[in-house]
């Protein structure tokens, strides 16, 4: 003979657990039905009647089989620096991600809590590490003749500044390069100003 199927609510055998998509109600001391995603428990079960489920209201959701008395509120609308990649429905929360040109500075369980604009490298600097969904751009000084530098920097008039010898880097910065991986004093070069006339050591352009 086939095993008898128990219909909810039912009292579980001592030491056994309720089946999939059922929960044990402490008050009724019965195994009762869970509500499906998109629904919540409107009336809890008793010894003689099963859980009564109802659909989630607008702007609320349940993602899992549940017996919560109220659906969860969807997150607030996406801000102007975000795009909605998943809408709020009865079965899922809204997910906001950062729009192009921005990255997630503060993430949450799903999506992003706070977006920030990606850094732009200034003249004389190029991209050392591009931005990702969760990290900002990192800039580094241009090497002489570095084509990447000119294409990644916003166009700004170049004010006169100082460069170092022997390898000039940027007219907007005064860089000197220590020896690689120093644990002792890095070597430095003296700085010279940019200009049409022969430079005098130790001055910068204003």
């Amino acid at each position: 003979l086939p095993a008898q199927v128990a219909f909810t609510p039912y009292a579980p055998e001592p030491g056994s657990t309720c089946r999939l998509r059922e929960y044990y109600d402490q008050t009724a001391q019965m195994c009762c039905s869970k509500c499906s995603p998109g629904q919540h428990a409107k009336v809890f079960c008793t010894k003689t009647s099963d859980t009564v489920c109802d659909s989630c209201e607008d702007s609320t959701y349940t993602q899992l089989w549940n017996w919560v008395p109220e659906c969860l509120s969807c997150g607030s609308r996406c801000s102007s620096d975000q795009v909605e990649t998943q809408a709020c429905t009865r079965e899922q929360n809204r997910i906001c991600t950062c729009r192009p040109g921005w990255y997630c500075a503060l993430s949450k369980q799903e999506g992003c809590r706070l977006c920030a604009p990606l850094r732009k490298c200034r003249p004389g600097f190029g991209v050392a590490r591009p931005g990702t969904e969760t990290s900002d751009v990192v800039c580094k000084p241009c090497a002489p003749g570095d084509a990447v530098c000119t294409s990644t920097s916003p166009t700004r008039s170049m004010a006169p500044g100082a460069v170092h010898l022997p390898q000039p880097v940027s007219t907007r910065s005064q860089h000197t390069q220590p020896t690689p991986e120093p644990s002792t004093a890095p070597s430095t070069s003296f700085l010279l100003p940019m200009g049409p006339s022969p430079p005098a050591e130790g001055s910068t352009g204003d």
């Epitope: 200034r122 600097f125 900002d136 800039c139 004010a159 907007r172 910065s173 000197t176 390069q177 220590p178």
Partner: antibody
Framework: QVQLQQSGPGLVKPSQTLSLTCAIS??????????WNWIRQSPSRGLEWLGR?????????DYTVSVKSRITINPDTSKNQFSLQLNSVTPEDTAVYYC???????????????WGQGTLVTVSS | DIQMTQSPSSLSASVGDRVTITCQAS??????LNWYQQKPGKAPKLLIY???NLETGVPSRFSGSGSGTDFTFTINSLQPEDFATYFC?????????FGQGTRLEIK
Amino acid sequence: QVQLQQSGPGLVKPSQTLSLTCAISGDSVSSDSSAWNWIRQSPSRGLEWLGRTYYRSKWYNDYTVSVKSRITINPDTSKNQFSLQLNSVTPEDTAVYYCAREDGVGGTKDYFDYWGQGTLVTVSS
Amino acid sequence: DIQMTQSPSSLSASVGDRVTITCQASQDISNYLNWYQQKPGKAPKLLIYDASNLETGVPSRFSGSGSGTDFTFTINSLQPEDFATYFCQQYDNLPITFGQGTRLEIK
């Protein structure tokens, strides 16, 4: 959470060398996104940026011209710290010296977001 | 070097007041300007970056504006903890330079 802890003497004699160290926790001196600065503050000169060191595949140093002939800023990767050496000091170098982390070197959003506690250095005989 | 001129050098105000500090650069620095707050015996603290962006965790009563050579820093509805010295700082060109500071005192 990034923390910067400064150490070094508070009194230096004229013509001697001022030496300060800044120990980093919560970041790395060889991080490819931070720069490590020394800034000083005195009633007469206000806040004065002295220089920085940072790593982007290789090490870079930038110094302000007014002290460039006397200053060295060194990273120490083994101890995760960086140091300031200022040679041939005079009473004019008396100030509170701060180390500071700079985020965003060479880009927009370039600022000092973490500072050491400050060290008052007096140059006097 | 780029000179940063702050005004006024000091000002007195009361809790609840709205105060404005200006910073003028000796040449065009785009929006490459930050504002810091410093309390006695403490290091400066970043409030505003890139002229108008509020640092995370800084109250919204602080704001900044401006571009080019003229910049403004405003505190709406002063709170007791806001009495301090405020500095602007440019990073358009090396050397990085600061304004001389504005000391905000209780009236």
